[in-house]
C-alpha cells in the first residue's frame, strides 16, 4: 500500500472521520508512520 506522507495523511483523515475524532492527541500525520495502518 501507499506509504508516502500524503497517503498517510489521507488515511489518517479517513480514520479520524470514521472514529468521530476520538483518537489519541498525538495521532497526527507527522507522528504516525505507515506501520500504524
Amino acid at each position: 500500500s501507499c506509504n508516502t506522507a500524503t497517503c498517510v495523511t489521507h488515511r489518517l483523515a479517513g480514520l479520524l472521520s470514521r472514529s468521530g475524532g476520538v483518537v489519541k492527541d498525538n495521532f497526527v500525520p507527522t507522528n504516525v508512520g505507515s506501520e500504524a495502518f
Epitope: C2, T6, A13, V28, P29, T30
Partner: antibody, heavy 119, light 107 residues
C-alpha cells in the same frame, strides 16, 4: 483561519543563494508535512520535496537534491527552502503547501514566491 | 518517476456544458491522485483527492473518477468561473508528479 504566508519576490544574481520562507498559522504546524512545489513560467508543477516539521526529516525529488534544502523553525511555525548555485533555470514561482486535517480538511497552498535569477 | 499525461492541453466548452479532463499515469498509482485548479495569477486550488473525493467547499459539479492508470475530472454545468488550468497529480510514490495541465477555455 489556516494561512501559509510566503516571503516576497526575490531578484538575485546567478551563482547566488536565496532562502524563501513560509509562515504557517491557524493550525498546529508540527502535525502536518510541508511540501514545496516549483512552477516555471508557462509550465507545469514540479514537486521539490517535503519536510516533517516535527523532526526535520526530509524527502527530496532527486532532481532537486543539491539544489534545494528544506528546514523548519518550530518556534515561529515557519518552513524554509534554500536554493543555491542559482541559474536562470531556477527562475520560477515557488509554493509551499500542506494538507491539513484539523481544523479544516484541505490542501492549503501559500500565495507563491516569485524568484528571478538575472545578472 | 511516474509520468502523468493529460490527453489534451486545451479544451473548449460552453457555459452549462459538461466537460471531462483526462489524465493517464505511466504505471499503476491506485487511487492516489489529486486534481488542482489554477486560475491566472492565483495559487493552485485543490479540488479532488484519492481520485474521487471532493475537498470541502468544492462545488459538487466537480467529480473525479478512475483508478490504476486512467483518471478523469468531470465538470458538469460549466460556469464562467471554471476558466482555468487543471492539473492531475499522483502521490502514490516519490517523487510526486503532476500532469502538464489542461487549459479550459469558455466559448
Amino acid at each position: 483561519e489556516v494561512q501559509l504566508q510566503q516571503s516576497g519576490p526575490e531578484l538575485v544574481k546567478p551563482g547566488a543563494s536565496v532562502k524563501i520562507s513560509c509562515e504557517a498559522s491557524g493550525y498546529t504546524f508540527t502535525d502536518y508535512y510541508m511540501n514545496w512545489v516549483k512552477q516555471s513560467h508557462g509550465k507545469s508543477l514540479e514537486w521539490i520535496g517535503d519536510i516533517n516539521p516535527n523532526n526535520g526529516v526530509t524527502t527530496y525529488n532527486q532532481k532537486f537534491k543539491g539544489k534545494a534544502t528544506l528546514t523548519v523553525d518550530k518556534s515561529s511555525s515557519t518552513a524554509y527552502m534554500e536554493l543555491r548555485s542559482l541559474t536562470s533555470e531556477d527562475s520560477a514561482v515557488y509554493y509551499c503547501a500542506s494538507i491539513i486535517i484539523v481544523p479544516d480538511y484541505f490542501d492549503y497552498w501559500g500565495q507563491g514566491t516569485t524568484l528571478t535569477v538575472s545578472s | 518517476d511516474i509520468v502523468m499525461t493529460h490527453s489534451q492541453k486545451f479544451m473548449s466548452t460552453s457555459v452549462g456544458d459538461r466537460v471531462s479532463v483526462t489524465c493517464k499515469a505511466s504505471q499503476n498509482v491506485g487511487s492516489n491522485v489529486a486534481w488542482y485548479q489554477e486560475k491566472p495569477g492565483q495559487s493552485p486550488k485543490a479540488l479532488i483527492y484519492s481520485a474521487s473525493y471532493r475537498y470541502s467547499g468544492v462545488p459538487d459539479r466537480f467529480t473525479g473518477s478512475g483508478s490504476g492508470t486512467d483518471f478523469t475530472l468531470t465538470i458538469s454545468n460549466v460556469q464562467s468561473e471554471d476558466l482555468a488550468e487543471y492539473f492531475c497529480q499522483q502521490y502514490n510514490s516519490y517523487p510526486y508528479t503532476f500532469g502538464g495541465g489542461t487549459k479550459l477555455e469558455i466559448k
